[in-house]
């Protein structure tokens, strides 16, 4: 007997073939011999079966022997044995009908889980296994777990189902609520204006919720909330910001923040949160804040950063075209009695430079 | 709800090939069939051919000579492809699914052939 | 090949007029015929499948009657929205064929 798969909601062809090339009478019957439809004459006759308002068949291959069955928005009750009576023989084809569901909404937050559950018809016995867009592999029974989604889980599910042999595949979109990036740092000079971006990782038609970013400065004992704001159909609006830092927002996403000058006090990390309307959970995005500063003061040349910056980075001061330098992996250097001329302060990270601040320095008389 | 998206080169040269593609959104491609219809401008319609997702095809007699129909089901598209084409090809091609009757239908490609 | 013939090739109708198109096949296809409403520029529309069966969506004013060679399409009173041009086509052999079209024009 042959096996054929189907999709909850699908539209499966079962196929029966007459050895002769023609116009002959043929019936569809169900396994408990209900008569689903058959032939009349040229015209196509149904019989009492729940399923004659979902089946057909395609009168213009009837002139080539073959008789199949099509049924339409398929039901996991469809699995059964059908029989297909042509020629005074009989063909019989099981069925059997799957569905693939996630359990919850399929638009989760970063760091939720994921259940997908399979729907099978009795008796059977299948096994399933998904891959993720990152391509990622699962493997289950009846229902397959994800514990932490990831962003990179974002996008369409494969999933395999497999029984007897045979395979139905199943496509699920899913979408991981998230920024594009889990941290960012921002590298300025001292009085530079300073943007923030937090683009999301995700399109939604209707977008809604709410924000805060709060702000822990490296010279600060405790954090504190910098800005707070509304998010309505992807127009942002400023509930409240703090006097100092003054920072402006933009009104359209991605969601923007101007800080109007890079200063050291404001140096330090922050955590900007997205509270989205219908979801349980934050969206969280980290962001640092770098700040340089060179300064000559009498005999001392110095060149500071403050904010999160890793041991491995090196400050390096050093004068143009001379090779005078003086490096280090520390959050300040300078050189004494200066020889005159630009001198440049350098933040760099395994030889890239990730901030330069340029100083003058007079010769004294 | 189903929909049908096609593309495809709008502009020919005489014995050129004609190359159209059909993607199926939101509804299921086994099962069904899949068509190509075409209609010269004032004119009447006329079935090019079908396609079914394993691969299945049948074709206008008028027509087989120079027509393929294929399959992508992975992408649940298929396409058609007309050889060495002449004035007489110029038409909105439409894609369409069926049973036995034609719905829904793609949104239309004007080809146009001419030197 | 089975070859469709509409009748009339043109017709010209008022709001509220009851309106009949004729379609005959050239050999016996049952009821194996679909009714189409094509407007410019616009893809065709099913509105009757099996010779009778009004299409989801479609307009009760819309009807199929007929089998064998002979079918007609009613409908029973015009609309503004009703104005386009008509195809029959046979589902019953390869090639699926049409009718030439007609065309619904207001008077």
């Known amino acids: 007997k042959k096996v054929v798969l189907g999709k909850k909601g699908d539209t499966v062809e079962l196929t029966c073939n007459a050895s002769q090339k023609k116009n002959t009478q043929f019936h569809w019957k169900n396994s408990n011999q209900i008569k689903i439809l058959g032939i009349q004459g040229l015209f196509l006759t149904k019989g009492p079966s729940k399923l004659s308002d979902r089946a057909d068949s395609r009168k213009s291959l009837w002139d080539q022997g073959c008789f199949s069955m099509i049924i339409k928005n398929l039901k996991i009750e469809d699995s059964d044995t059908y029989i297909c009576e042509v020629e005074n023989k009989k063909e019989e084809v099981e069925l059997l009908v799957f569905g693939l569901t996630a359990n919850s909404d399929t638009h989760l937050l970063e760091g939720q889980s994921l259940t997908l559950t399979l729907e099978s018809p009795p008796g059977s016995s299948p096994s399933v296994k998904c891959r993720s867009p990152g391509g990622k592999n699962i493997q289950g029974g009846r229902t397959i777990s994800v514990p932490q989604l990831e962003r990179q889980d974002s996008g369409t599910w494969t999933c395999t189902v497999s029984q007897d042999q045979k395979t139905v595949e199943f496509k699920i979109d899913i979408v991981v609520l998230a920024f594009q990036k889990a941290s960012s740092t921002v590298y300025k000079k001292e009085g530079e204006q300073v943007e923030f971006s937090f683009p999301l990782a995700f399109t939604l038609e209707k977008l809604t919720g709410s924000g805060e970013l709060w702000w822990q400065a490296e010279r600060a004992s405790s954090s504190k909330s910098w800005i707070t704001f509304d998010l309505k159909n992807k127009e942002v609006s400023v509930k409240r910001v703090t006097q100092d830092p003054k920072l402006q927002m933009g009104k359209k996403l991605p969601l923007h923040l101007t800080l109007p000058q890079a200063l050291p006090q404001y140096a330090g990390s922050g955590n900007l949160t997205l509270a989205l309307e219908a979801k349980t959970g934050k969206l969280h995005q980290e962001v640092n804040l770098v700040v340089m500063r060179a300064t000559q003061f009498q005999e001392n040349l110095t060149c500071e950063v403050w904010g999160p910056t890793s041991p491995k980075l090196t400050l390096s001061l050093k004068l143009e075209n001379k090779g005078a330098t003086v490096s280090k992996q520390a959050k300040a250097v300078w050189v004494l009695n200066p020889e005159a001329g630009m001198w440049q302060c350098l933040l760099s990270d395994s030889g890239q430079v990730l901030l330069e601040s340029n100083i003058k320095v007079v010769p004294t008389w | 709800q189903v929909q049908l998206q096609q593309w495809g080169a709008g502009l020919l040269k005489p014995s050129e090939t004609l190359s159209l593609t059909c993607a199926v959104y939101g509804g299921s491609f086994s099962g069904y069939y899949w068509s190509w219809i075409r209609q010269p401008p004032g004119k009447g319609l006329e079935w090019i051919g079908e396609i079914n997702h394993s691969g299945s095809t049948n074709y206008n007699p008028s027509l087989k000579s120079r027509v393929t129909i294929s399959v992508d089901t992975s992408e649940n598209q298929f396409s058609l492809t007309l050889i060495s084409v002449t004035a007489a090809d110029t038409a909105v091609y439409y894609c369409?699914?069926?049973?036995?009757?034609?719905?829904?239908w793609g949104q239309g490609t004007l080809v146009t052939v001419s030197s | 090949d089975i070859q469709m013939t509409q009748s009339p090739s043109s017709v010209s109708a008022s709001v509220g007029d009851r309106v009949t198109i004729t379609c005959r096949a050239s050999q016996d296809i049952s009821n194996w015929l679909a009714w189409y409403q094509q407007k410019p520029g616009k893809a065709p529309k099913l509105l009757i499948f099996?010779?009778?069966s009004l299409q989801s969506g479609v307009p009760s004013r819309f009807s199929g009657s007929g089998s064998g060679t002979d079918f007609t399409l009613t409908i029973s009173s015009l609309q503004p929205d009703d104005f386009a041009t008509y195809y029959c086509?046979?589902?019953?052999?390869?090639?699926?064929?049409f009718g030439q079209g007609t065309n619904l024009g207001i008077k």
């Open positions: 099996a010779a009778s």
């Open positions: 369409v699914r069926l049973i036995n009757w034609f719905d829904p």
């Open positions: 086509q046979q589902a019953n052999s390869f090639p699926y064929t």
